[in-house]
Interface confidence: medium
């Protein structure tokens, strides 16, 4: 097993607005959970836009997942990440 | 389940600040989402704030984000709420309370502490 | 604010009958995932509450199965089969759909 790194960037988007993604890389198996979170709950699927999990050249997979959310509210979102049994959460940066 | 141990209580002037505390044991504190609550004599509750371990992050009532602070200390599982500028108004029970999102995928204030009754007085 | 309106404020009881708790929200609590995270607790007196069911009519663990939660939308119900002694106190319902999250006033339920 290789635990995904996880990073988790922001960008702008419409006005008041920003778009945070959450990529997970270099894990092995290829199976993960990877959702974004508003007060701790998992925000529904079409709240969220996905990538695929692909293969990255070094035999391990990487995906990513997004969500775009109100600027000033970032503290309420977190990224939750479950792989082979470990789990963290990762918040979006200042 | 765990245990949360809240401080003892509390007897202060208006116009002061009390720091509640709310030690941890038994789970992962990290992983956890604590948040506060307060509960006049004989009145409903009125949910304050939550933080999440794990990174310090917050989300507060409005009508509390003047009068609390929420803080954690992972070093000592032990989650903390400050209340300033105390007026008769702040005279409450006050609770911490741990969020369930993983047992039960998401139950709110699952396991709660003993309370802490603070009371503002000149 | 959503606001959480319990009826009746109390509800005297025989033990071993059945009781209804109705609970109504100002506006609809579904969260935007899709759920509703509406909740019941129980205060009993000098004690701190008590999680009984979640997400509508989900038990908690060890509550007892006469406990039960229904309701969609803007209306919801508590129902205990058949009342027992430490089933007395205050039961407050609570939406955690919507910030802030917000309590119910509370019913009292007590021996008749």
């Known amino acids: 097993t290789v635990p995904p790194m996880v990073n988790v960037t922001r960008s702008e988007a419409s006005e008041g607005n920003i778009t945070v993604t959450c990529r997970a890389s270099s894990f092995y198996p290829r199976n993960i959970i990877l959702t974004w979170r508003q007060d701790g709950v998992s925000l529904s699927h079409d709240a969220q836009q996905w990538g695929d999990v692909l293969p990255d050249g070094n035999g391990t997979y990487q995906t990513w997942v997004a969500t775009r959310i109100c600027r000033g509210e970032e503290q309420r979102f977190t990224c939750y990440m479950e792989h082979s049994g470990n789990h963290s959460t990762h918040p979006v940066p200042s | 389940q765990g245990q949360m141990q809240q401080s003892g209580a509390e007897l202060v002037k208006p116009g002061a600040s009390v720091k509640l505390s709310c030690k941890t044991s038994?789970?992962?504190?990290?992983?956890?989402?604590i948040s506060w609550l307060k509960q006049k004599p004989g009145q409903s509750l009125e949910w304050i704030a939550w933080?999440?371990?794990?990174?310090?992050?917050?989300s507060y009532n409005q009508k509390f984000t003047a009068k609390a602070q929420l803080t954690v200390d992972t070093s000592s599982s032990t989650a903390y709420m400050q209340f300033s500028s105390l007026t008769t108004e702040d005279s409450a029970i006050y609770y911490c309370?741990?969020?369930?999102?993983?047992?039960?995928?998401?139950?709110?204030?699952?396991?709660w502490g003993q309370g802490t009754l603070v009371t503002v007085s000149a | 604010d959503v606001l959480m309106t319990q009826t009746p404020l109390s509800l005297p009881v025989s033990l071993g009958d059945q009781a209804s708790l109705s609970c109504r929200s100002s506006?609809?609590?579904?969260?935007?995932?899709?759920?509703?995270?509406l909740e019941w607790y129980l205060q009993k007196p000098g004690q701190s509450p008590k999680l009984l069911i979640y997400?509508?009519?989900n038990r908690f663990s060890g509550v007892p199965d006469r406990f039960s939660g229904s309701g969609s939308g803007t209306d919801f119900t508590l129902k205990i089969s058949r009342v027992e002694a430490e089933d007395l106190g205050v039961y407050y319902c609570?939406?955690?759909?919507?910030?802030?999250?917000?309590f119910g006033g509370g019913t009292k339920v007590e021996i008749k």
């Open positions: 309370a741990r969020h369930d999102y993983y047992g039960t995928s998401g139950a709110w204030f699952a396991y």
């Open positions: 038994g789970f992962t504190f990290s992983d956890n989402y």
């Open positions: 933080i999440y371990a794990g990174t310090g992050g917050t």
């Open positions: 506006q609809n609590i579904v969260h935007i995932n899709g759920n509703t995270y």
């Open positions: 997400k509508v009519s």
């Open positions: 609570f939406q955690g759909s919507h910030v802030p999250w917000t």
